[in-house]
């Protein structure tokens, strides 16, 4: 467990000409606030998916009124940090969306009006416990400067907040196999063992021996999916046996999401997944156009010349999402055939093919036997992307060039002696055994466990293996 912290340093016009108009005016004073949404960076969720790592809203900033004729300065910001608590391990790679919102304080009927000023997104690597990382992002003509960090909440430590620390039981040193907790040298790393059988996918623990469930799962070992179908009422009492959860009225009741947005509950509130062209806490904001620069990572904005027509971002190879904000793990689609190794080079995919295969996706099976001769009467057999020789009797090796010693593999069982023979090998069996490889015991009364020996061969005679 831990907290992701975001510090906004400034929000104002970016460098260069084309400065944006101030969002506030003497007639329409306003104030800013920010929203941050975090997702695990390696997740293959859709770009519009909920903020799986969490989300947070800042406080409102000071009221600002534009000075007539003055260019838009850096706008006054809310105090304090935006904090996004995370319950589980810190993923190390994460995607963020930071939205700058304007709250208009004129005489609106029904309270203040909100509108989205700017939206930036990115994907970063970050170890928990590290220093503040600084960043600058541009959205259209606006520029946002901010810092962020992830820190673990005691007793968790480490770059993923998965190790636990406990006060030392002995003053001098930690227990066997346990290290001191840097930077808390007076504490010791604690082994974290969840309750036996706790689902590794759907459960976690913050204390040894416990099993706490991720959202959507229940039961003592977090193996029961939450379902309301077996409940007496849609929001019946919580029960680990039936898997019924979510008592009382839910935050999505009545669907607070406008414009066709879909609502999903979060631990603290709700999250609206908005259709393309709509944004905001409740999908109430429309009118984002290509002029707002909504496409990240080199994406090209298509359509959306006016607020009434939705834009589409065409993303460069390697990015996806409605705003090209998400890097694609193209190797997860397993494009390399025939066991080829996939390499995502960023600008392109490469397949490293196994022997005997070729082509951009290792799709071509080479003629393994072409130009390859097997010596001494052997025949070439294709298979597995590499040629193989099936050798004539008495020869072996990759190309049948080696004379085989048929006795090398000790083929005679039960102490039988092997003799090389022009047509193969012969086993001279020890008393009490018979068969081509001396594999059958002879019964004391002279009968064998198998049909009698062929005519002309007595038990104990050498058996020639043809």
């Amino acid at each position: 467990a831990g907290v992701f912290e975001l510090q906004i340093h400034s929000f104002g016009p970016g460098p260069g000409p084309g400065a944006p108009r101030s969002p506030c005016s003497a007639r329409l004073p306003c104030r800013l606030f920010f929203r941050v949404c975090l997702k695990p960076g390696l997740s293959e969720e859709a770009a519009e998916s909920p903020c799986a790592l969490g989300a947070a809203l800042s406080a409102r900033g000071p009221v600002y009124t534009e000075q007539p004729g003055a260019p838009a300065p850096d706008l006054p910001l809310p105090d304090g940090l935006l904090q996004v608590p995370f319950r589980d391990a810190w993923p190390g790679t994460f995607s963020f969306i930071i939205e700058t919102w304007r709250e208009e304080l004129g005489d609106q009927i029904g309270g203040p009006a909100w509108s989205l000023l700017a939206r930036v997104a990115g994907r970063r690597r970050l170890a928990a416990g590290g220093p503040w990382a600084r960043d600058i992002q541009r959205a259209g003509a606006w520029e946002l400067r901010f810092s962020y960090r992830a820190r673990c909440e005691p007793p968790a430590v480490g770059t993923a907040c998965t190790r636990l620390c406990r006060p030392r039981s002995a003053p001098s040193r930690c227990g066997p196999g346990l290290r001191p907790c840097a930077p808390l040298e007076d504490e010791c790393e604690a082994p974290l063992v969840c309750r036996a059988g706790c689902s590794p996918e759907h459960g976690f623990c913050e204390q040894p021996g416990e099993c706490r469930c991720l959202e959507g799962w229940t039961g003592p070992l977090c193996t029961v999916p939450v379902s309301t179908s077996s409940c007496l009422s849609p929001r019946g009492p919580s029960s680990a046996t039936t898997g019924c959860l979510v008592p009382g009225p839910g935050p999505c009741d009545g669907n607070p999401c406008a414009n066709g947005g879909s609502c999903s509950e979060t631990p603290r509130s709700f999250e609206c997944t908005c259709p393309r062209g709509f944004y905001g806490l409740r999908c109430e904001v429309s009118g984002v156009t290509c002029a707002d620069g909504p496409c990240f990572n080199g994406g090209l904005c298509v359509g959306g010349a006016d607020p009434d027509s939705a834009y589409i971002c065409h993303c460069p190879p390697g990015f996806q999402g409605s705003n090209c904000e998400k890097r694609v793990d193209r190797c997860s689609l397993q494009p390399c055939r025939n066991g080829g190794l996939c390499l995502d080079l960023g600008h392109a995919l490469r397949c490293r093919c196994r022997a005997g295969f070729a082509g951009p996706r290792c799709e071509h099976d080479l003629d393994d036997c072409a130009g390859r001769a097997c010596a001494n009467g052997g025949t070439c057999v294709e298979g597995g992307g590499a040629h193989r020789c099936s050798c004539a009797l008495g020869f072996g090796g990759r190309d049948c060039r080696e004379r085989a010693d048929p006795c090398a593999a000790r083929p005679c069982a039960h102490g039988g002696r092997c003799y090389a023979h022009f047509s193969g090998l012969v086993c001279a069996c020890a008393p009490g055994y018979m068969g081509a490889r001396c594999e059958f015991p002879v019964h004391p009364d002279g009968a064998s466990a198998l049909p009698a020996a062929p005519p002309g061969l007595r038990p104990g005679d050498p058996q020639r293996y043809l």
Partner: antibody, heavy 118, light 108 residues
Framework: QVQLQESGPGLVKPSETLSLTCTVS????????WSWIRQSPGKGLEWIGY???????NYNPSLKSRVTISVDTSKNQFSLNLNSVTAADTAFYFC????????????WGQGTLVTVSS | EIVLTQSPDTLSLSPGERATLSCRAS???????LAWYQQKPGQAPRLLIY???SRATGIPDRFSGSGSGTDFTLTISRLEPEDFEVYYC?????????FGQGTRLEIK
């Protein structure tokens, strides 16, 4: 090294269809967007459109009603069809590869002159 | 569409001098998605700069790009004889992709 080579007739009659093919060597056509650009003395450089795999295309609105760009991954080629041509379509036509960090053009063919005349 | 206007149309300088070419957009170019090209007679354009300031592979460091919003600049710090060609800017933030009309750099 990626190389692009345009091919097709250098002379097209008015009202007919201009058809050009770009053959890509030294790289897989599946991994990038591919574009056509033309250059005429009167209009300078003009982007025509692009294709990605075969399912994503985008065309210049000024030409959209007349243009089709398609790709043949098996031959490592992509093609331009511009129908109902007039003398105003006389230009050098370039095929180009679109870059990996955005929709700029990092590799170009040497270009082919197409004249529209009866 | 975003109209790109390059200035001057022709720039006359001597080898060794510094060249400053301007490209102005009719509206803000998203996220500095602007490229510069050089074109020699009878050849295709060659990419010099993308992302307003990133040099393409193999481009000498005397070429540099700057700017954001609506104003962008290509600078050639010390002109070599082979630099006297035509230069184009191109925006790729908003469809349709558009080019400037070009600036001819000639020897004074």
């Amino acid at each position: 090294q990626v190389q692009l080579q345009e091919s097709g007739p250098g002379l097209v009659k008015p009202s007919e269809t201009l058809s050009l093919t770009c053959t890509v060597s030294g790289g897989s056509i599946s991994s990038y967007y591919w574009s056509w650009i033309r250059q005429s003395p009167g209009k300078g450089l003009e982007w025509i459109g692009y294709v990605y795999y075969s399912d994503i295309t985008n065309y210049n609105p000024s030409l959209k009603s007349r243009v089709t760009i398609s790709v043949d991954t098996s031959k490592n080629q992509f093609s331009l069809n511009l129908n109902s041509v007039t003398a105003a379509d006389t230009a050098f036509y370039f095929c180009a590869r679109i870059g990996v960090a955005g929709f700029y053009f990092d590799y170009w063919g040497q270009g082919t002159l197409v004249t529209v005349s009866s | 569409e975003i109209v790109l206007t390059q200035s001057p149309d022709t720039l006359s300088l001597s080898p060794g001098e510094r060249a400053t070419l301007s490209c102005r957009a009719s509206q803000s170019v998203s996220r500095r998605y602007l490229a510069w090209y050089q074109q020699k007679p009878g050849q295709a354009p060659r990419l010099l700069i993308y992302g307003a300031s990133s040099r393409a592979t193999g481009i000498p460091d005397r070429f540099s790009g700057s700017g954001s919003g609506t104003d962008f600049t290509l600078t050639i710090s010390r002109l070599e004889p082979e630099d006297f060609e035509v230069y184009y800017c191109q925006q790729y933030g908003t469809s349709p992709i558009t080019f400037g009309q070009g600036t001819r750099l000639e020897i004074k």
